[in-house]
């Protein structure tokens, strides 16, 4: 069955935590859908943003911080490993320097670390996709 | 009770006709929520746009039509009389020359027609907004 | 109020079986996934079964192929089936959902009080 959209979960982050999403673009790429995955400071949507990863399907991938309320330095890459249509399995593994996005078991991206993924209090899910599929992996220590 | 997102609905426009939408951002302005109107040639959504309305909330509002597939001039307004966390009531009449957007009934926007509004067949509602009205209404002749 | 109540903990003997429940009830309004974790005496709280919303499961290599997750979404109810159980699985089961309760905006964890299986002759 199908997850809410917005999706928000309360979520602690550090190094080998894994998040899950799985889901399916709600348009076709012509109509430019997109996706969008948070990472927040804290339980309230307009806190800091220690990750912020959209995906405008069939054309780019951005990737920023929002700190103390502004937006720093955007990351774009051209990289389009979602297909039209399908559905599609992403992964955003924290590593001890940064994170890094699998797109259907294929490395797709990376983002350094700005702020310590400790501060990490909530994710959420958004814009154009249904989803199916969503789970926080933590490294047994 | 809440209409589906993305909306759709088959729908013959002439002058005199207005599409009204009530709905409401699913976001805080600060995460710049998206609303979208695109008034379709077919029932498909790749088909051609006749009227597309793009508001990014608490920033700008973009209309243009795509034609033959690609996408052709766009007009791009700052007016932002949507209000953050507020319900809002949109409605699209058709003018003989143009459509006239009204935003909680305050004119906000123009588009002049560049495809003649009877090639409308279907309309679609979309983005990161919650909608609890839709109606199409046709002046009596 | 969300409550996470686990049942059909007991002793049992080598090879036997055993299936826990867990239902969870209160207001909710979405489940995101349910599972089992585990903890024996002396040692951390680890991973047993995880079932998700598409219905895919996962599992902790140690009980592949002898447990099953299953999941009753009508009931809020999530189930641990235990075959050929080994002393080693003795410890406190534990249920965790991961869900929204009604009147909440997010999704956050909610764990069960654990029920105790003994696996021993």
């Known amino acids: 069955s199908l997850l809410p959209v917005p999706y928000t979960e309360a979520a602690s982050l550090s190094t080998g935590s894994t998040v899950t999403i799985k889901g399916r673009p709600l348009a076709c790429f012509l109509n430019e859908p997109y996706l969008q995955v948070d990472f927040h400071t804290e339980m309230k949507e307009e806190s800091d943003i220690v990750f912020h990863f959209q995906v405008c399907f069939g054309r780019r991938v951005v990737m920023n911080s929002r700190e103390y309320g502004a937006w720093k330095q955007q990351v774009e890459s051209k990289n389009m490993p979602f297909q039209d249509g399908q559905e599609f399995e992403l992964s955003i593994s924290v590593l001890p320097d940064k994170y890094q996005v699998m797109v259907n078991g294929q490395s797709s991206y990376t983002f350094d670390h700005r702020i310590k993924p400790e501060a990490v209090k909530m994710v959420q899910v958004w814009r154009d996709i249904s989803l199916t599929k969503f789970n926080v992996s933590y490294l047994k220590r | 009770s809440l209409l589906p997102v993305p909306y759709t609905e088959a729908a013959s426009l002439s002058t005199g006709s207005t599409v009204t939408i009530k709905g409401r951002p699913l976001a805080c302005f600060l995460n710049e929520p998206y609303l979208q109107v695109d008034f379709h040639t077919e029932m498909k959504e790749e088909s051609d746009i006749v009227f597309h309305f793009q508001v990014c909330f608490g920033r700008r509002v973009v209309m243009n039509s795509r034609e033959y597939g690609a996408w052709k001039q766009q007009v791009e307004s700052k007016n932002m009389p949507f209000q953050d966390g507020q319900e809002f009531e949109l409605s699209i009449s058709v003018l003989p020359d143009k459509y006239q957007v009204m935003v909680n009934g305050q004119s906000s926007y123009t588009f002049d027609h560049r495809i003649k509004p009877e090639a409308v067949k279907m309309v679609q509602v979309w983005r990161d907004i919650s909608l609890t009205k839709f109606n199409v209404s046709y002046l009596k002749r | 109020q969300v409550q996470l109540v686990e049942s059909g903990g007991g002793l049992v003997q080598p090879g036997g079986s055993l299936r826990l429940s867990c239902a969870a009830s209160g207001s909710i309004f979405s489940i995101s996934r349910m599972g089992w974790y585990r903890q024996a005496p002396g040692k951390q709280r680890e991973l047993v079964a995880i079932?998700?919303?598409?219905?895919?499961?996962d599992y902790a290599d140690s009980v592949k192929g002898r447990f099953t997750i299953s999941r009753s979404n009508a009931k809020n109810t999530v189930y641990l089936q235990m075959n050929s159980l080994k002393p080693e699985d003795t410890a406190v089961y534990y249920c965790?959902?991961?869900?929204?309760?009604?009147?909440?905006?997010?999704?956050?964890?909610?764990w069960g009080q654990g029920t105790q299986v003994t696996v021993s002759s």
């Open positions: 965790k959902s991961v869900l929204r309760a009604a009147g909440y905006g997010y999704f956050n964890q909610y």
């Open positions: 079932i998700f919303s598409d219905a895919s499961t």
